[in-house]
Amino acid sequence: QEEDLPRPSISAEPGTVIPLGSHVTFVCRGPVGVQTFRLERDSRSTYNDTEDVSQASPSESEARFRIDSVREGNAGLYRCIYYKPPKWSEQSDYLELLVKESSGGPDSPDTEPGSSAGPTQRPSDNSHNEHAPASQGLKAEHLY
């Protein structure tokens, strides 16, 4: 009998509000034994996979998807899904990435603290939309 796979989680480092031109890394987490992580975007058809999976803890594995220079087109909803043979998990909740103009003011922090919860986390409709776009293991640049 196949095991029930836990839903993955998604977070963003250093946060979910990123100044234009700065970098952001999406972190997808799942159980140990994950072969492939896929990062998808709502409403876009692009995606990427990575098999560069590391062990984050004795019970958890993770993959990181980095965008070196965030553009306005990177704003939007992102989610993760993973493949642990012989099947895919459900999707994670959506994480919303916000892109803001660089203010440069010393009183305004560049980013929010990294978080996988809070107002930027949205439920993913797993009944149908298994199929939104995604991003890659090392770089996630073409998820515009």
Epitope: S45, T46, Y47, H128, E130, P133
Partner: antibody
């Protein structure tokens, strides 16, 4: 590559299963769609098996066909075909990195439904 | 159900000329869109996807544009080898499933 098989001449109402066989890539990562083309007509979408195990059908195909997959194949079962189902049937795999385009197509398999 | 209306049904142009084919979707489909070329007796060939990215091996004479509901395929510097039927397709699998649908096709005749 992908290649269709199972096309043949059958009488109306005779169930028929077409198979799309994948080689040279890991099928688990990809969506596979089935498309058909009646003689002299345009392309008609039948349905798809997505990488995550979901199956979708065109509205006209619901109840008329069933799509299923294994680790290396995606089957299209025609439950009770009629003469209107005579066509060349294609399967296709989406492009790496983008769900919107299907770059890998099989040569097609001809299905003839006739009494 | 999603409908893709492709125009014109047929178009003729001279070698070296330009052809424009349009595809209108009945609902917004974002970037879930592609153009294919098919010649008699052959399988369809992916030209453009996403909906402006050139598929591998396709010359830049082929250009795709648009998003949402309006899409355009432009073929410039027409060659005899471009004579074929061209189809648009949406393969959107969203929360409100729109599915895979083809346009009716456009026959391109090169004079």
């Amino acid at each position: 590559s992908v290649k269709e098989s199972g096309g043949r001449l059958v009488t109306p109402g005779t169930p028929l299963t077409l198979t799309c066989t994948a080689s040279g890539f890991s099928l688990y990562k990809y969506n596979i769609q089935w498309v058909r083309q009646a003689p002299g007509k345009g392309l008609e979408y039948i349905g798809a098996s997505t990488y995550a195990g979901y199956t979708y059908y065109a509205s006209w195909a619901k109840g008329r066909v069933t799509i299923s997959r294994t680790s290396t194949t995606v089957d299209l079962k025609m439950t009770s075909p009629t003469t209107e189902d005579t066509a060349t049937y294609f399967c296709a795999r989406h492009i790496d990195g983008d769900y919107s385009g299907y770059a890998l197509w099989g040569p097609g398999t001809l299905v003839t439904i006739s009494s | 159900e999603l409908v893709l209306t492709q125009t014109p049904a047929s178009v003729s142009a001279a070698v070296g000329g330009t052809v424009t084919i349009k595809c209108q979707a009945s609902q917004s489909i974002g970037t879930w869109f592609a153009w294919y070329q098919q010649k008699p007796g052959q399988s369809p060939k992916l030209l453009i996807y996403g909906p402006s990215k050139l598929a591998s091996g396709v010359p830049p004479r082929f250009k795709g544009s648009g998003s949402g509901t309006e899409f355009t395929l432009t073929i410039s510097d027409l060659e005899c080898a471009d004579a074929a039927t061209y189809y648009c397709q949406s393969t959107y699998f969203g929360v409100d499933y729109l599915g895979g649908t083809f346009g009716g096709g456009t026959e391109v005749v090169v004079k």
